[in-house]
């Protein structure tokens, strides 16, 4: 089971998955750019069934979603649902 660990570590993803998740089952996405002590970009996906997974930023399918979100946010105000912070 892939999990997000809330520890003292600056990187929050212990494991990452590249397995495709259909968009309709994604509730929200958090993107953490590299920095703040974590040397890599992290993408955390909350699914409609309340489970959480860290996704490999290189996965082609998540890149397609990110690109769509970028296009959307450039034409409309940012959608807060995709900006949820981990407590």
């Amino acid at each position: 089971v892939l999990e997000v660990y809330y520890t003292h570590l600056r990187c929050r993803c212990v494991q990452e998955s590249s397995v495709f998740i259909p968009r309709r089952f994604i509730d929200r996405i958090q993107i953490s750019p590299r920095g703040n002590g974590c040397p890599r970009k992290e993408i955390i996906v909350w699914k409609k069934n309340k489970s959480v997974v860290c996704v490999d930023p290189q996965a082609e399918w998540i890149q397609r979603i990110m690109e769509m979100l970028r296009k959307k946010s450039s034409s409309t105000p940012p959608v807060p649902v995709f900006k949820r912070k981990i407590p």
Epitope: V19, F20, R23, K47, K48, N49, S51, K72
Partner: antibody, heavy 120, light 106 residues
Framework: EVQLAESGGGLVQPGRSLKLSCSAS????????MAWFRQAPPKGLEWVAS????????FYRDSVKGRFTISRDNAKSSLYLQMDSLRSEDTATYYC?????????????WGQGVMVTVSS | DIQMTQSPSFLSASVGDRVTINCKAS??????LNWYQQKLGEAPKRLIY???NLQAGIPSRFSGSGSGTDYTLTINSLQPEDFATYFC????????FGGGTKLELK
């Protein structure tokens, strides 16, 4: 040729259980998300539940959460729907369908449907 | 949850006619909208996926358009085999079907 064959339907009393099965052939079953849909004349078509490639993730419509369980056996190329605490509003024809594969390709394969009647 | 409002519920037309069926979503569905045809006693069959992509093997007289919340299925030059029930389906967030349009011979 892709085939999806549902079985296990029938007449059942409210509050009782029923398990639907769907046997798949003609494609690599484990490469696909799978789903159950249903159709009852007054309500039209409804999505019921979906399951990921390995069965690790499942998703349900609100009205069946806690009562229905979707599962799969990739070794047998079979999809299941365990239906507990059945209600009259669950009466419908239930269809087994494919969803996306690993690449995001979304084919359109449906079984012939199986009738479930919940009545006393 | 996303609601899909499909109109009209019933449509009478003649062979050779051009008909349009509409679906309106309760929120933006980002073009994740499919159209299905269903004949009596059969499973639904997908005609169009993601707003305007024709499913393999489906005649080119079927076409789809739309964006945001508003989507349309157009059938040009109706053929006898086109008289059936049509449904839209959003798959942007879980799944929701429209209520269906029964296309009947006038």
């Amino acid at each position: 040729e892709v085939q999806l064959a549902e079985s296990g339907g029938g007449l059942v009393q409210p509050g009782r259980s029923l398990k639907l099965s769907c046997s798949a052939s003609g494609f690599t079953f484990s490469d696909y998300y799978m789903a159950w849909f249903r159709q009852a004349p007054p309500k039209g078509l409804e999505w019921v539940a979906s399951i990921s490639y390995d069965g690790g993730d499942s998703f349900y419509r609100d009205s069946v959460k806690g009562r229905f369980t979707i599962s799969r056996d990739n070794a047998k190329s079979s999809l299941y729907l365990q239906m507990d605490s059945l209600r009259s509003e669950d009466t419908a024809t239930y269809y087994c369908t494919t969803e996306e594969d690993y690449s995001g390709s979304f084919p359109d394969y449906w079984g012939q449907g199986v009738m479930v009647t919940v009545s006393s | 949850d996303i609601q899909m409002t499909q109109s009209p519920s019933f449509l009478s037309a003649s062979v050779g006619d051009r008909v349009t069926i509409n679906c309106k979503a309760s929120q933006n569905i980002n073009k994740y909208l499919n159209w299905y045809q269903q004949k009596l006693g059969e499973a639904p069959k997908r005609l169009i996926y993601d707003t305007n992509n024709l499913q393999a093997g489906i005649p080119s007289r079927f076409s789809g358009s739309g964006s945001g919340t508003d989507y349309t299925l157009t059938i040009n030059s109706l053929q006898p085999e086109d008289f059936a029930t049509y449904f839209c389906l959003q798959h942007n967030s879980l799944y929701t079907f429209g209520g269906g349009t029964k296309l009947e011979l006038k």
